[in-house]
């Protein structure tokens, strides 16, 4: 849940890639305007979750999400909300 | 804002050799399974994609990040 | 267009040191990994070693872990592969080789090649 | 390490003729698979990038196939410039080259 909240765009089109689901993808690159070639090279990469099946993109799947939710990321995140806590509270 | 290390991840699925993506993959899952499974997708994207695909995949991934969406 | 020019070859004796250096020149330099091989005389084709286009990452054949060491200057637009512990298997034409951008041709331009003896 | 085993090791063959040069991987590579052509005296040059598809100034007569573990290299009417020694390269797990195959014109 904390991942999607620090790029949601980046996850929809990540599981929209891994889940080979054509028209998900359509609609995500659709809210970041991707141009056609941008469009056709996201397929592509689509194309090999498919070929390689349902185990292959749950297991990658599963990569994104340690990545994401890591100590790299979340240490990050943690690191980003005191930020934002700083500023509120000077910004009072 | 897209965190660091995802980003390193997605920069070497596109731009680096398997052995980087697997290496970097390692750091976070060093299952067999999942280290076999990224060889596989990392191998095929290499073998699908043009230079000029992979240029436009990193554009749009430029976009993404700049997006007010992320 | 794409050139690749190696030099540093040479008579060494076994446990000796050498230098190879290969010289890039018409296309961007630090926007493609870089490679060295190798061919002994009369025999086939032997990967050695990778390096990335910032030079962060390198990786080696079994041969020569621990030996030799690939390394580059991207504002010299330079590659270089410093030999150490020669043994007389290391003799052998040793050629640097781009690859495509992004992993997208292995190996898709080689120099020419500089002979390297290990003998005493 | 991956290892790959080229067939045959020498092929002697006639202007115009078909050649058929096989490639296997001790274990599967996808379409990691690479191929070169090297002349007497002469740096190697890239024909065929991952296993099918042609590099840039490539005669047409040098087609490759396959995926996995099995990959061949065809050149299809074979002309007396094309002898040479042809080495496949996979670039799945670090780099490993064929041991080679001669071809000669008879």
């Known amino acids: 849940v904390k991942m999607a909240e620090t790029c949601p765009i980046f996850y929809d089109v990540f599981f929209a890639v891994a889940n080979g689901n054509e028209l998900l993808l359509d609609l995500s690159l659709t809210k970041v305007n991707a141009t056609e070639p941008e469009r056709t090279a996201m397929k592509k990469i689509q194309d090999c979750y498919v070929e390689n099946g349902l185990i292959s993109r749950v297991l990658d799947g599963l990569v994104m999400t340690t990545i994401s939710s890591s100590k790299d990321c979340m240490g990050e995140a943690v690191q980003n909300t005191v930020e934002d806590l700083k500023l509120n509270t000077l910004g009072r | 804002e897209i965190c660091p290390a995802v980003k390193r991840d997605v920069d070497l699925f596109l731009t680096g050799t398997p052995d980087e993506y697997v290496e970097q993959v390692a750091q976070y899952k060093a299952l067999p399974v999942v280290l076999e499974n990224a060889r596989i997708l990392k191998n095929c994207v290499d073998a699908k994609m043009t230079e000029e695909d992979k240029e436009n995949a990193l554009s749009l991934l430029d976009k993404i990040y700049t997006s007010p969406l992320c | 267009q794409v050139q690749l020019v190696e030099s540093g070859g040479g008579l060494v004796k076994p446990g000796g040191s050498l230098r190879l250096s290969c010289a890039a020149s018409g296309f961007t330099f630090s926007d493609y990994y870089m490679n060295w091989i190798r061919q002994a005389p009369g025999k086939g084709l032997e990967w050695i070693s990778y390096i990335s286009s910032g030079g962060s990452t390198t990786y080696y054949a079994d041969s020569v872990k621990g030996r030799f060491t690939i390394s580059r200057d991207n504002a010299k637009n330079s590659l270089y592969l410093q030999m150490n512990s020669l043994r007389a298997e290391d003799t052998a034409v040793y050629y640097c080789?781009?690859?495509?951008?992004?992993?997208?041709?292995?190996?898709?331009?080689w120099g020419q090649g500089t002979l390297v003896t290990v003998s005493s | 390490e991956i290892v790959l085993t080229q067939s045959p090791d020498f092929q002697s063959v006639t202007p115009k003729e078909k050649v058929t040069i096989t490639c296997r991987a001790s274990?599967?590579?996808?379409?990691?698979l690479h191929w070169y052509q090297q002349k007497p005296d002469q740096s190697p040059k890239l024909l065929i990038k991952?296993?099918?598809q042609s590099f840039s100034g490539v005669p047409s007569r040098f087609s490759g196939s396959g995926s996995g573990t099995d990959f061949t290299l065809t050149i299809n009417s074979l002309e007396a410039e094309d002898a040479a020694t042809y080495y496949c390269l996979q670039s799945s797990s670090l780099r490993t080259f064929g041991q080679g195959t001669k071809v000669d014109i008879k």
């Open positions: 274990q599967s590579i996808g379409s990691s």
């Open positions: 991952y296993a099918s």
């Open positions: 080789a781009r690859d495509g951008k992004y992993n997208t041709s292995p190996g898709d331009y």
